[in-house]
Each structure stands twice: as C-alpha cells, then as structure tokens.
Amino acid sequence: MMTGTIETTGNISAEKGGSIILQCHLSSTTAQVTQVNWEQQDQLLAICNADLGWHISPSFKDRVAPGPGLGLTLQSLTVNDTGEYFCIYHTYPDGTYTGRIFLEVLESSVAEHGARFQIP
C-alpha cells in the first residue's frame, strides 16, 4: 500500500530573466527513492538517479542546474516557462509518486515569489 505523500512548493511565480527552485519532498513512507524525474507536460527536464546522479535534457542544459538536493533550479526564465512541472518519485517498493508545481513567469519586476521551500 502506498502511504507516502508529496509536498511541493505549489503555485509559484517568478520574474522573467530570474531563477526559481522547483522542490518536492516525499514523506510518510519508508520506501527507498531510486529516481526522481522532473518533467514539464510531455518534456523531460532532468532525472536524478540515486546511484548514477543527474541526467539533464540537452534542450534545458543551459538553463537548468541540478539541486539543491533532489530539486531543480530553473534559470533565465522566460514567459514560455509558465506552466505545470511534475516531480515523479520512483520508489521501491511503493512505486511512483507524482507532485505538481505550477510556475507563472511574470513580465513585471514586482513578481511575488512563492515562499522558498525548505526540506527539514
């Protein structure tokens, strides 16, 4: 039975040209995290394999930085980056957990930043 839950940063906004940390945290399970995939709709941004480290999709390699932790830092944001992002936790023996983050990239320089997510 899958008992875990994914906590995410939820809905966040950031300024065009700035950067943002996408962060998820899996809790309430003792399952072993084998891999975390970061995806946007039908696109793969990055994979963090617990043993093999990071794979960054070439289309994002100049704008994505691994971390902190299992999170992902998106840089040089454009309005086209607005949309849904998914963290997909592959775990053993539970299976797959998915978290959702909605990012809005604003033209305005007075964009409200969502509270930075801290893993305890």
């Epitope: 696109q43 394999n49 093999l52 990071w54």
Partner: antibody, heavy 119, light 107 residues
C-alpha cells in the same frame, strides 16, 4: 583524446569468476559515469550496470545483482567489472562505456573483452 | 523493465536510399532515447542522444525524432559505410534497455 582500453580475452570454466579492467585516459575520470554492457555472440546489447566514480554510487541491472561487482580505482582511472558463478550463457563480449557529461547515454566505448565460458 | 521493440529486424537497401527504423517503448520514456551504430567486431558508436540530438562528429544524414513511446531513426541518403546494425536504447529508468537491433544490409 578520450580512450577506454580493456583487458584481454578470457577463457573460464563454469562456476569461476572473471574480472575485466577498463583503463581510461583523456578526461577527468571521476566526473563521468561508467557503464558496463555485454553482447552474446550474434545477439543484442544488454546493460549490466553503471557506476559513478565520484561518490561510488552503483546501479545494477537486477538480472546481474549478486553476480556482478563494479568497482573503480580512482588513482589509476580504471574501472573493473567482476562476474562470478559463470555459466555458458555468460559467454559474450563485455564493454565498458563512458556516460556522457550529465547524461546517461554512452559516448565513448572500450574495444570490448571476449569472455568464453566453457568446460 | 521497459521493453524496446525495433522494426524492422533487418533491412536491405541501396546506396542513396532513405532508410527509416522505428523503436517502440513499452511505456512513456519522454525523449530519453539514444541510437547506436555497430559494425561487426567493433564497439557500438553513439549517433543520436535524447531522441533527436546528433552526437559530435556524426554526419547530418543521420537524424532522430519522437517522444513518449514512438521513436524514429532516419538515414537520409545511405552511404557504403552505413551498412551496420543499429540499436535504440532507453535511459529513462534503470535497468537501461536496448532494442533487439536492426541489421542494415546491402541490396
């Protein structure tokens, strides 16, 4: 120039073990994952596992877990793959292959080591 | 494990022909697919990574496309040195798996 040079062909008896080396040069060894792939005669490619030298992280294909052991010697920039309890079906060419930078595909390959298991 | 099915398994073609090989994954792998060329007695050589990116030094006649479960590898105009076996590989999740290969032969 990136190079991966593997040890020579081996003939082993069933039940024995074999240890293949893969000496690398031309790049910073600890920054790239090393994969091991095998190919039985006339057959396709099969991923055995991969190792990240900087932190020692190892991912094994479950099929080989318990029989395959991946190690590295950072001082000589050499990767090793040991396979134990050999059987005839393990007769194959074994390749080491470097994972591309921040990617899981393999951009440089060793020349291969033929392991023959025969009684 | 994710299964990759290549088609056709073998293919006869002539120099100058346009050749297409397909690779179907048993589940969504996004764009985490690579294509390799292997000649007899030699190690595989990376041609395409992340579904559509040509590796350094690979001629422009080689291309790849696709996303999700369906991928295509194309040689726009076959050259004599292109006769070999081609493999797709997924690196979306471990164990990384390969297709069974497509042997490209001279007609």
């Amino acid at each position: 120039e990136v190079q991966l040079v593997q040890s020579g062909a081996e003939v082993k008896k069933p039940g024995a073990s074999v240890k293949i080396s893969c000496k690398t040069s031309g790049y910073t060894f600890t920054e790239f994952t090393m994969h091991w792939v095998r190919q039985a005669p006339g057959k396709g490619l099969e991923w055995i596992g991969g190792l990240k030298p900087d932190n020692g992280g190892i991912s094994y294909n479950q099929k080989f877990k318990g029989r395959a052991t991946l190690t590295v010697d950072k001082s000589t920039s050499t990767a090793y793959m040991e396979l134990s309890s050999l059987r005839s079906e393990d007769t194959a060419v074994y390749y080491c292959a470097r994972g591309a930078y921040y990617r899981y595909d393999a951009d440089y390959w060793g020349q291969g080591t033929l392991v023959t298991v025969s009684s | 494990d994710i299964q990759l099915t290549q088609s056709p398994s073998s293919l006869s073609a002539s120099v100058g022909d346009r050749v297409t090989i397909t690779c179907k994954a048993s589940q969504d792998v996004k764009t985490a697919v690579a294509w390799y060329q292997q000649k007899p007695g030699k190690a595989p050589k990376l041609l395409i990574y992340s579904a559509s990116y040509r590796n350094t030094g690979v001629p422009s006649r080689f291309s790849g496309s696709g996303s999700g479960t369906d991928f295509t590898f194309t040689i726009s105009s076959l050259q004599p040195e292109d006769f070999a076996t081609y493999y797709c590989q997924q690196h979306y999740s471990t164990p990384f798996t390969f297709g069974q290969g497509t042997k490209l032969e001279i007609k």
